[in-house]
Amino acid sequence: APMGSDPPTSCCFSYTSRQLHRSFVMDYYETSSLCSKPAVVFLTKRGRQICANPSEPWVTEYMSDLELN
Amino acid sequence: APMGSDPPTSCCFSYTSRQLHRSFVMDYYETSSLCSKPAVVFLTKRGRQICANPSEPWVTEYMSDLELN
């Protein structure tokens, strides 16, 4: 972000309790290092952003899979 | 957001140091109480989101003005 622009930052305070369908997930990003809770945000085909727990095996699996593709 | 959708939450970690031009500001929202810092986010005509300190007089003034309009 440009200096002085001060936009808000996306943080997660809860995680999805359900494993997402892999076919719905298009991309992901780790939340900011300023956020108190570690999280991965998955971006879906419908444009939704969903918080997920990076310590869950399906989350790291999806991240690896998306990286390869 | 629908239950269980767990989208990320907008949080502010710094505030704009400059007072925004009132004519540029179209809307605002207060950040979640889950965020570590209280903040108001102003939405500008250009679609930018800018974090502001709710304890500053100009911020509360703009909020009141936007409520009335």
Partner: antibody, heavy 115, light 107 residues
Framework: QVQLQQPGAELVKPGASVKMSCKAS????????IHWVKQTPGQGLEWIGA????????SYNQRFKGKATLTADISSSTAYMQLSSLTSEDSAVYYC????????WGQGTTLTVSS | DVVLTQSPATLSVTPGDRVSLSCRAS??????LHWYQQKSHESPRLLIK???QSISGIPSRFSGSGSGTDFTLSINSVETEDLGMYFC?????????FGAGTKLELK
């Protein structure tokens, strides 16, 4: 494949500053935070801080606030760490690493502060 | 800050031994505990992430277990190439912290 490339060594005089680079390739740079770690024989591994390339957010270990400044340039997929007011205490190996699990590390830059 | 205490500081082994390395956290780090191996003059290498998740390319003799504050890295049949330093690290809270390490050496 994922790579984080760092210059091998930097020799700097006391009081000066140095800006180290960490060039990322093989993945989407904005998807992961980049962490910086200091390693010395006496102190072991110390987390300096992290930068989020997506938006430039930074967080620091209190011990390194005022000493380190982290930035990221999306156009070149490169993260930077500037260290200022260098002393012999800053002589160490500095690593960049990717993501919460630090799954990939750079080769490390050996910083020597000496007159 | 979360303090990670590793024990023993040094472990003398014979090839073929099964060994366990301990990492104790001063407060709960949930599942955000990772293990790294570092050989002399090399960068650390991720061995196990999130307590027990295996890493592609890492031999299956390495495994991790534990929860909350007590964690273990096990090597079920040590090979000479496994000699070096082993560090645990937590990414549950800022600042991320590392243990002081366990040195694996030949008996």
């Amino acid at each position: 494949q994922v790579q984080l490339q760092q210059p091998g060594a930097e020799l700097v005089k006391p009081g000066a500053s140095v800006k180290m680079s960490c060039k990322a390739s093989g993945y989407t740079f904005t998807s992961y935070n980049i962490h910086w770690v200091k390693q010395t024989p006496g102190q072991g591994l110390e987390w300096i801080g992290a930068v989020s390339p997506r938006n430039g957010d930074t967080s620091y270990n209190q011990r390194f606030k005022g000493k380190a400044t982290l930035t990221a340039d999306i156009s070149s997929s490169t993260a930077y760490m500037q260290l200022s007011s260098l002393t012999s205490e800053d002589s160490a190996v500095y690593y960049c690493a990717r993501g919460y699990g630090y799954d990939y590390w750079g080769q490390g830059t050996t910083l020597t502060v000496s007159s | 800050d979360v303090v990670l205490t590793q024990s023993p500081a040094t472990l003398s082994v014979t090839p073929g031994d099964r060994v366990s390395l301990s990492c104790r956290a001063s407060q709960s780090v949930s599942k955000y505990l990772h293990w790294y191996q570092q050989k002399s003059h090399e960068s650390p290498r991720l061995l196990i992430k999130y307590v027990s998740q295996s890493i592609s390319g890492i031999p299956s003799r390495f495994s991790g277990s534990g929860s909350g504050t007590d964690f273990t890295l096990s090597i079920n049949s040590v090979e000479t190439e496994d000699l070096g330093m082993y560090f645990c690290q937590q990414s549950n809270s800022w600042p991320h912290t590392f243990g002081a390490g366990t040195k694996l050496e030949l008996k």
